[in-house]
């Protein structure tokens, strides 16, 4: 069957796999006049890798809480048994009711864009629900994800998130929108309002048009022991133990303390949704307790003192002292001042000496004063804040915060690449490729100090020499290395990096990138001498930029062969001279040759070789460049991409035969790189360039 080049380049010729994984097809090429011998196009088929998603793909979250994604929720696998690190999820559409973030990264940062299955297994991918202003009973969120692991085809996944007050939540013991308890002065009355007790989230389970005729019925199952509940001034008692959410909302529920002490009080209740006129509806219900704290009317509330942030290194433990948490309260003992953790950061937890290994959520000032309270930095090295509430048991709780700054245990200066300075410019900006500090995360606030300066140049910021600079200045491209001495092709300097109290040193290497166009083309024939000219090495642009004639010095190579100066004409006396130095002018004059040798001690065949050159020009630093080339046994039928000044001896003896194309000792025609009429890079051009022989 015949296929044309245009069909190939138009993508109209398809290969359909069937049978074994290794195989291919034979073909010949013809331009209508000439036909090439047979070729074989090898095709290797890969087994198709399939990705699959298991797990419920549903996550139940307690309102206002953080819940890790787990393997029960999201579990990807591949038919090739791919490492979970290589199973990548991309967040196509993030959550609407909260956010997704990584436990080991700053929880205040940007939304998570991608994560791996391994991170899911580790429990590091967290969904945080953000409480809306309006009450709700159940809310639904979705995350649209795309699972990918090349070469497998991507798989779309939807993770459904159910945020429900129905769920049993250790972080939130109440199923109601609010159940905060009440503070009442001894012997006095206080209104219980929806700021303290609010079941409007139960009502939210009813569609809004019908909501006005529904209500929540509270039945008191255990009455206060030190006071009385009243609804619209009517006392509640065992015979009349009910009140409604609507009465609460109207401010009709009151607790009256009976006096005689400041012991705790409270009541237990059941609450359920009821329909119009109390009819039954299939709505939510809950049984809970409402706490009432009676305080001494003469008491002065505690005064929180200014707090110093706690600083400690990642992976360590540090005691919390009065510098972090203290109050002034003349009429309370330290043991009576209680702290409760309302919200904890993700960078560690509080623990009590002798209180078990796990985190504590309640402690006293006495625990702080005695040094029993400590912070364990088991998370990432980020700053975090504990939101606490503090109370002396007699005054309403006061909000307090404790800032914890986790310092990295060690930092590393990452040097991804040496600094390359363009030869004609003599200067270049540093970037994250040269200097970047990481601990367990990136350190964008890092600062650098020069502890050993460069020998042949300066570091500049804003055009002025500097010995100190920041990561921010690097990222903005403001830190520049400039050569001041044009005698070396490389330099180096040493910096000390400082990030959040930890330092590390590193050496930045500087190299000059030669302004030289190098083109070796296809393989060069062993045993031949080819012309070195601007089609192979060209420093013409450097010549223009420096208004000088660039000079080349041969530093190394070739391993098999040598660079020679060739006579201008046959009449010129002497053979080829070995060259160690030459100029751009020599190249342009065509006076240089490269004798391509044969590798000794091995069978004839393809080989590789190179030249290492130092390029000099006026007023710019020198640069080292290399010319890498491939060699092969001479093939008279092959159109080489460079001019051949001579061909191997063996080929010359064949000169009388019709196939010989290069007269002895004469420069061969300069063969250009084959460029067929079809678009470059097409399949046909690949075949033409590589398969005619």
């Amino acid at each position: 069957r015949t296929r044309s080049g245009s069909q190939l380049d138009g993508g109209l010729v398809l290969f359909s796999h069937r049978g074994t994984l290794d195989g291919g097809f034979r073909f010949r090429l013809s331009d209508g006049e000439h036909t090439s011998p047979g070729h074989f196009f090898r095709v290797t088929a890969q087994k198709q890798v399939l990705l699959s998603l298991k797990g419920s793909q549903t996550l139940t979250v307690c309102p206002g809480s953080v819940q890790p994604l787990s393997s029960q929720t999201l579990r990807a696998s591949s038919s090739a048994g791919t490492d979970p690190q290589l199973l990548l999820y991309r967040v196509v559409r993030g959550p609407q009711l909260g956010r997704l973030f990584h436990a080991q990264q700053d929880s205040t940062g940007e939304a998570l864009v991608n994560f791996t299955q391994a991170e899911v297994y580790a429990g590091n991918i967290l969904y945080e629900h953000e409480m809306p202003p309006e009450p709700f009973w159940e809310a639904h969120d979705t995350l649209e994800l795309q699972l990918s692991s090349p070469p497998a085809r991507d798989v779309a996944a939807t993770l459904a998130v159910a945020v429900s007050f129905e769920a049993a939540c250790p972080q939130r013991p109440s199923h109601l929108w609010k159940n905060k308890g009440l503070w009442v002065p001894e012997g006095q009355r206080a209104r219980i309002t929806v700021a303290a007790l609010d079941a409007s989230n139960l009502l939210a389970s009813v569609p809004s048009p019908q909501r006005s005729e529904h209500d929540v019925l509270f039945q008191v199952t255990q009455f206060p022991s030190r006071g009385q509940l009243l609804v619209s001034e009517e006392p509640l008692h065992a015979g009349q133990p009910h009140f409604l959410q609507s009465q609460l909302a109207a401010g009709q529920l009151v607790y009256a303390h009976g006096g005689g002490g400041t012991q705790q009080d409270g009541f237990h209740f059941r609450a359920h949704l009821q329909g119009p006129a109390g009819a039954s509806v299939a709505g939510p219900q809950t049984s809970e307790a409402f706490a009432i704290t009676v305080r001494d009317v003469n008491e002065r509330p505690p005064q929180p003192q200014a707090s110093v942030p706690l600083r400690l290194t990642r992976g360590s433990r540090a005691p919390i002292s009065r510098a972090q948490l203290s109050v002034v309260d003349p009429d309370s003992a330290p043991g009576e001042i209680e702290y409760e953790v309302q919200r904890a950061p993700h960078n560690g937890f509080l623990s009590l000496v002798g209180g078990g290994l796990g985190p504590v959520t309640r402690f006293t000032q006495a625990d702080v004063d005695s040094g029993r309270l400590a912070f364990v930095a088991n998370g990432s090295s980020v700053a975090g804040i504990f939101q606490l509430s503090m109370s002396d048991g007699a005054s309403p709780p006061l909000p307090m915060s404790l800032a914890v700054d986790i310092l990295p245990s060690a930092i590393e200066v990452q040097l991804r690449a040496p600094l390359e300075v363009p030869q004609a410019l003599g200067r270049s900006s540093l970037s994250q490729q040269q200097l970047r500090v990481v601990s367990d995360r990136e350190e964008p606030e890092a600062a650098y100090r020069l502890i050993q300066g460069p020998q042949y140049g300066h570091l500049l910021v804003g055009g002025r020499p500097t010995s100190a600079f920041s990561q921010f200045q690097i990222d903005q491209g403001e830190v520049v290395f400039a050569f001041t001495n044009s005698s070396s092709s490389h330099d180096h300097f040493r910096v000390l990096a400082l990030a959040r109290g930890v330092n590390a040193s590193a050496v930045v290497n500087v190299t000059v990138r030669a302004l030289l166009h190098v083109w070796a083309g296809g393989p060069w024939p062993q045993g031949a001498t080819l012309r070195l000219d601007p089609t192979v090495l060209d420093a013409g642009e450097l010549a223009n930029r420096t208004d000088s004639v660039p000079r080349f010095r041969l530093l190394e190579g070739p391993r098999h062969g040598r660079v020679v100066r060739v006579p201008r004409a046959r009449t010129e006396p002497g053979g080829s001279q070995l060259v160690e130095q030459f100029t751009q002018q020599d190249l342009e004059d065509g006076r240089l040759g490269l004798e391509v040798g044969r590798p000794e001690g091995r069978a004839p065949g393809p080989a590789g070789d190179s030249l290492t050159l130092e390029l000099w020009a006026q007023g710019v630093p020198p640069a080292v460049a290399s010319l890498d080339f491939a060699t092969e046994p001479y093939n008279a039928a092959r159109p080489y991409s460079v001019a051949l000044l001579s061909v191997p001896e063996a080929a010359r003896t064949e000169a009388g035969k019709p196939e010989s194309s290069t007269p002895t000792g004469e420069p061969g025609p300069m063969a250009s790189s084959p460029e067929p009429a079809v678009a470059k890079g097409g399949f046909l051009s690949f075949l033409e360039a590589n398969m005619f022989s």
């Epitope: 005729e213 619209s232 009349q240 009910h242 009709q252 359920h272 009821q274 006129a277 109390g278 039954s280």
Partner: antibody
């Protein structure tokens, strides 16, 4: 002391309308639904409907739909029940009842309405 | 509508004995969400309005003597009056307060001998 005091007995001709009142006292009027229940002589109890004194919303039994209207006057804490197109079988004692949830904890003394030609 | 059926229509029980009245609903009046049975019992004496005895099938109203008790769930309920007193002579009604229209049983007349 919760009290529901109803208007006095009435005699009506068939086809006429009647309007019975129920005045509440001793509690917050707008907090509790008022229901109307009737009892024909020697018969059982029959629920007619409810009114929410707070919103004025009503719900009537299908049997009385189109004939009954319940209204309230929050300034006097009074609820009214009007029944039109009276027939002899509407002869009954009409009770108003205050509901706590949906059971009837307090009842008015009843109003006898006789429909006779 | 939920139909309430009481049995017996009438009964006569000796003073000091126990009386049992049954009530059956045509469909369940149990709310599975809050586990409440929406059923009440009333007592009515001639010339008087009814008086609430029991709600939620088994909760006694304030001031009701503890000789009165309610039991049952779903569709079958019972009012039990222990050690009958002369003043217990009356007509007893069950009522479902599960859904509107709220409906009553036809009544059970209790006489004391």
């Amino acid at each position: 002391q919760v009290q529901l005091v109803q208007s006095g007995a009435e005699v009506k001709r068939p086809g006429a309308s009647m309007k019975v009142s129920c005045k509440a006292s001793g509690y917050t009027f707008t907090n509790y639904y008022i229901h109307w229940v009737r009892q024909a002589p020697g018969q059982g109890l029959e629920w007619m409907g409810w009114i929410n004194p707070n919103s004025g919303a009503t719900n009537y039994a299908q049997k009385f739909q189109g004939r009954v209207t319940m209204t309230r006057d929050t300034s006097t804490s009074t609820v009214y029940m009007e029944l039109s197109s009276l027939r002899s079988e509407d002869t009954a004692v009409y009770y108003c009842a205050k509901s706590w949830v949906s059971w009837f904890a307090s009842w008015g003394q009843g109003t006898l309405v006789t429909v006779s030609s | 509508d939920i139909v309430m059926t009481q049995s017996p229509d009438s009964l006569t029980v000796s003073l000091g004995e126990r009386a049992t009245i049954n009530c059956k609903s045509s469909q369940s009046v149990l709310n599975s969400k809050n586990n409440r049975n929406y059923l009440a019992w009333y007592q009515q004496k001639p010339g008087q309005p009814p008086k609430l005895l029991i709600y939620w099938a088994s909760t006694r109203e304030s001031g009701v003597p503890d000789r009165f008790s309610g039991s049952g769930s779903g569709t079958d309920f019972t009012l039990t009056i222990d050690s009958l007193q002369p003043e217990d002579s009356a007509t007893y009604y069950c009522q479902q307060h599960y859904s509107t229209p709220f409906t009553f049983g036809q009544g059970t007349r209790l006489e004391i001998k």
